[in-house]
């Protein structure tokens, strides 16, 4: 299957990386994270039409079965293919510490 | 966050492994696969409510932002956490061959 990057639904409608500006309060982190106070959260949003950014064989199968049984099998879903790491300054019992999270911000997206 | 396995929506409603019986024709494979003629396709289907089988920190963030901005940010999605390999007997130019696919059948599921 072609691992298509051209969206048949129109520009920006298909699975792609979006940036959402969020505060610690928005993220539910205000009680344990000190910094950064605001995060540009990158996440995967958009539709997954046939052959668009199919992650693997499973995604192809899912799309074919979705066409046959749309009430039973959902369409593939837009999710991160990889992540960017991020460091947070956190509260600890004794003060503050640095912690790296490698699964926090989406780096690129595909359909599964 | 708790990586919950108890579905608050009722039994069987949340993200879990389902088996869908499919023929080669259903899968769109009839022109290149000889065997098996039918496949028990395992896939991930179901809702992803808050804290249910959250794959990672990104899933937590996505759920929190979905609550705040449901029209902009979709809820986390039920996708495979790992796969089971499967061997297919395929047609080739010279006859038939065996080929293993490691990304074909979902083994377990989580919310991303």
């Amino acid at each position: 299957a072609r691992n298509g990057d051209r969206c048949p639904l129109g520009p920006g409608r298909c699975c792609r990386l979006h940036t959402v500006h969020a505060s610690l309060e928005d993220l539910g982190w205000a009680d344990w994270v000190l910094s950064p106070r605001e995060v540009q959260v990158t996440m995967c949003i958009g539709a997954c039409p046939s052959q668009f950014r199919e992650a693997n064989m499973h995604a192809q199968i899912k799309m074919n079965l979705h066409r046959l049984k749309p009430d039973t099998v959902p369409a593939p879903c837009c999710v991160p293919a990889s992540y960017n790491p991020m460091v947070l300054i956190q509260k600890t019992d004794t003060g503050v510490s640095l912690q790296t999270y490698d699964d926090l911000l989406a780096k690129d997206c595909h359909c599964v | 966050a708790r990586n919950g396995d108890r579905c608050p929506l009722g039994p069987g409603r949340c993200c879990r492994l389902h088996t869908v019986h499919a023929s080669l024709e259903d899968l769109g494979w009839a022109d290149w696969v000889l065997s098996p003629r039918e496949v028990q396709v395992t896939m991930c289907i179901g809702a992803c409510p808050s804290q249910f089988r959250e794959a990672n920190m990104h899933a937590q963030i996505k759920m929190n932002l979905h609550r705040l901005k449901p029209d902009t940010v979709p809820a986390p999605c039920c996708v495979p956490a790992s796969y089971n390999p499967m061997v297919l007997i395929q047609k080739t130019d010279t006859g038939v061959s065996l080929q293993t696919y490691d990304d074909l059948l979902a083994k377990d599921c989580h919310c991303v």
Partner: antibody, heavy 119, light 110 residues
């Protein structure tokens, strides 16, 4: 244009105190962390610590904890590195560097401040 | 001694391809990212590669980074005289936070 401009070279005697500075411009100073990195003569780079200028949260490398103090004055977009009692082994080039937005790398560096400690 | 291990020196002729390795462990490179910095003689370091394989704007595509397991490498193709510099890898370690390699001096021959 993002710039980090550091204070000039210093020559000090052992036991003296010192405070060197790093002034940021061309960006929102409180939106990015600032780190300090030491380079001893002919040697490699060593991370000393980090400060979030917006809340003045500081974290030090275990190797430098208690040896130096990192601070910032957001009203003048300046970060500082200071010693209360210098040693000859503090002789080095000191760089300030701005963290990229994920906090994982240093995307802009100051020109460096050479500190020489000698009796 | 650095947490990340680099060869002290590498060399190559103009136009050649050279690679610089950076070896770590499962507590740093193995689970996280690697960044690379170039330090030209007498100047401050400059970001060359971030998050394993991303180039900041302005860095020529002759420079590329990769990571496999607990090691990373920086490749420079079409070597030029102005590439002569010290190169440092940097990652994160759970005990020491930000860690650098010991640095590699690249000499362009001829």
């Amino acid at each position: 244009e993002v710039q980090l401009v550091q204070s000039g070279a210093e020559v000090k005697k052992p036991g003296e105190s010192l405070k060197i500075s790093c002034k940021g411009s061309g960006y929102s100073f409180t939106s990015y962390w600032i780190g300090w990195v030491r380079q001893m003569p002919g040697k490699g780079l060593e991370w000393m610590g980090v400060i979030d200028p917006s809340g003045s949260y500081t974290i030090y490398s275990p190797s430098f904890q208690g040896q130096v103090t990192i601070s910032a004055d957001k009203s003048i977009s300046t970060a500082y590195l200071q010693w209360s009692s210098l040693k000859a082994s503090d002789t080095a080039m000191y760089y300030c560097a701005r963290y990229g937005r994920y906090g994982t790398y240093f995307d802009y560096w100051g020109q460096g401040t050479l500190v020489t400690v000698s009796s | 001694q650095s947490v990340l291990t680099q060869p002290p020196s590498v060399s190559g002729a103009p136009g050649q391809r050279v690679t610089i390795s950076c070896s770590g462990s499962s507590s740093n490179i193995g689970v996280l990212y690697v960044n690379w910095y170039q330090q030209l003689p007498g100047t401050a370091p400059k970001l060359l590669i971030y998050s394993n394989d991303n180039r900041p704007s302005g860095v020529p595509d002759r420079f590329s980074g990769s990571k496999s397991g607990t090691s990373a490498s920086l490749a420079i193709t079409g070597l030029q005289a102005e590439d002569e510099a010290d190169y440092y890898c940097q990652s994160w370690d759970s005990s020491s936070n930000y860690v650098f390699g010991g640095g590699t001096k690249l000499t362009v021959l001829g």
